[in-house]
Structure formats: C-alpha cells, structure tokens
C-alpha cells in the first residue's frame, strides 16, 4: 500500500512540526493505525502511534508527543517538543487493521529539521 508524505519539513521556532501522511485509498477500511517512526541510522524508534476508526474521524492521537486529525485517507500529524537533537527522518507507517485483509505501508520519510532558538540576549 502506497503511503505519501512530504520530503522535508522545517519545525517552528517552538519545536513544532506538522505534515500530512496520505495513504492509498482505504477502500472499506474501518480501523486504521498510524505510527510515526524515527529512523536513526539502521535503527527505528517509535515516536507515537494511534488507531482511529471511520466512525470517529476527527480527533485521534491523544499523546504528549503527537497530535493529529484524520479525514478520509489523510492524516494531519503534528509532533511537538522537538529540539535540534531531534532533527532526523520521520517515517509514517499506516496499517489497515479491520476488516480483513490487513494492509501495511510505509512512507519514504519526512526529514524534519529543528533549529533551537537563539537565547534572548540579556537586556540592561
């Protein structure tokens, strides 16, 4: 299953990065699981994950790191609390969980660049 996501995203000065993860038509998928993975070298670590259903399309991902909304086969993901050391490749993984058959797809990843804000100079 094809999963599309932007190649590059620049985090805001507050350490917030948003991107859209879009998957090939869900057909009659009723339950979808979306996972954000961070790739560092050959290792992948899970940043956040959530399952949502077509009956409850809007709010999903009630998580300290990620928030998001879904609409059809698009998921709007927001990752918060990012710092310069979190710069890296973030991969969107989508699983069509129910009803069968099970499908899984992974995007090519979104390179998120995070620049720590310069500290404010002391004012006299």
């Amino acid at each position: 299953m094809h999963v599309a996501q932007p190649a590059v995203v620049l985090a805001s000065s507050r350490g917030v990065a948003s991107f859209v993860c879009e998957y090939g038509s869900s057909g009659n998928a009723a339950e979808v699981r979306v996972t954000v993975l961070r790739q560092a070298g050959s290792q992948m670590t899970e940043v956040c994950a959530a399952t949502y259903t077509v009956e409850d399309e809007l709010a999903f991902l009630d998580d300290s790191t990620c928030t998001g909304t879904s609409s059809g086969n698009k998921v709007n993901l927001t990752i918060q609390g990012l710092r310069a050391m979190d710069t890296g490749l973030y991969i969107c993984k989508v699983e069509l969980m129910y009803p069968p058959p099970y499908y899984v797809g992974m995007g090519n990843g979104t390179q998120i660049y995070v620049i720590d804000p310069e500290p404010c100079p002391d004012s006299d």
């Epitope: 869900s26 057909g27 009723a30 009956e55 129910y98 099970y102």
Partner: antibody, heavy 116, light 112 residues
C-alpha cells in the same frame, strides 16, 4: 440522513432467480462494506457475507457459495443480492447492513417467498 | 467456523428487575490486532436489528446505560440493570473477528 432502502422481494417459483437491491443514501457508498443477512421465518439471523464497495470483492459464508452473488452499481449507490436456482429454503427476509466496526445501519428487510 | 452459543434461549423478567444473557464462542474471538469484535443487537418483531453494544463493552450512541456488555476471550455477557417494557425482543450476539462472521442463535426476552 443515512438510509438503506431495500426492494426486489417477491413470490418466485422454485428454480427461478431473483435480484434483491439495497440503495444507500446519506453517506459515501464506497467507504463502507455492505453485508447481507438472512432470516428464515421464525429463525435467527444468519450472516451471508459482504462485498467491499470500493474493490467490488465479495466474501461469502460457506452456506452461500454457488447460487448467491453480491454485486454493485456504484453510480446508483446500490448493492445487489442475486439468488439463482431458487429453493423453498431460500424463503426468508433478507437484510442489507452497512458495516464499519459494527452494524449501525440496516435496511428494512425484503421478503422473498419461494413457492410453486 | 466460530459457533456462537447463547443462553438462555428465552427469559421472562418483571419490569425493574435485572436480566443477563450469555454468549459463548467456540474459540477465542480476539482479532489479530488485539481487538474483540463482539456485538449485541436487539430485534423487535417486524423490525431490523438495532445495535446495542460493540467491541464487547462499548455502548452505541443513544443506547441507555441500563445496557452493559462484558467478557473476554470466549465468554461474553449482556446485562440489563433494570428491564423496561421497551426491552422486549430477541437479543443476538455477533462476532466479526473471524470470517465467516457469525451470529448467536438469539435469546428472547419477554416481560412478565
């Protein structure tokens, strides 16, 4: 308002064929699977199978393989159940039902009577 | 195929009294994603079934909180804390975890 309106039930002679229809409205037809459920007189509910309204792929329960065919007309937002070589034991109320992770919406049912 | 066995076949309950219906599956109905797609429906004479409970214990919108579902693995229960006249009908459990999906045989609830 989401609705499933059924039609096509009739009195048919054994050996004949019938096509029951289920017209959906109020939602995107191709987003949800359409299921068919049989209820013989005085009996319980029997799951016949479902059709993926996006791909058109049907899944049949064992008892309904062969003489039964699920089909679609997506332009009309309608699912069909065709039964061939009708037998007396096909006499029943047939329901269509929209499924996601449950069945919140059902057709009103259509009665098929097979008798000579 | 997963056989869903409901007990009792029928029960007669006075208004205000509790009622309980059991549904047992012939094998575990935990789906591969960890969810259990076990539902309860009520059918009244001449009507289509109506959804009460999904995923074992989740009440569908508009269903009174008198209805509750519980269970895991192979044993499931629908409870009505205080039966009302409108609750009469046939109750069916349904498993949507393993194809072919299957209904229980039904339990008829009558009011005394």
């Amino acid at each position: 308002e989401i609705q499933l309106v059924q039609s096509g039930g009739d009195l048919v002679k054994p050996g004949g064929s019938v096509r029951l229809s289920c017209k959906a409205s109020g939602y995107t037809f191709t987003n949800y699977g359409m299921n068919w459920v049989k209820q013989a007189p005085g009996k319980g509910l029997q799951w016949m199978g479902w059709i993926n309204t996006y791909t058109g792929e049907p899944t049949y329960a064992d008892d309904f393989k062969g003489r039964f065919t699920f089909s679609l007309d997506n332009a009309k937002n309608t699912a069909y159940l065709q039964i061939n070589s009708l037998r007396a034991e096909d006499t029943a109320v047939y329901f269509c039902a929209r499924r996601s992770i449950y069945y919140p919406y059902w057709g009103q049912g259509t009665t098929l009577t097979v008798s000579s | 195929d997963v056989l869903m066995t409901q007990t009792p076949l029928s029960l007669s309950v006075s208004p205000g009294e509790p009622a309980s219906i059991s549904c047992r599956s012939s094998q575990s109905i935990v789906y591969s994603n960890g969810n259990t797609y076990l539902e309860w429906y009520l059918q009244k004479p001449g009507q289509s079934p109506k959804l009460l409970i999904y995923k074992v214990s989740n009440r569908f919108s508009g269903v009174p909180d008198r209805f509750s579902g519980s269970g895991s693995g192979t044993d499931f229960t629908l409870r009505i804390s205080r039966v009302e006249a409108d609750d009469a009908g046939v109750y069916y459990c349904f498993q949507g975890s393993h194809v072919p999906w299957t209904f229980g045989g039904g339990t008829k609830l009558e009011l005394k």
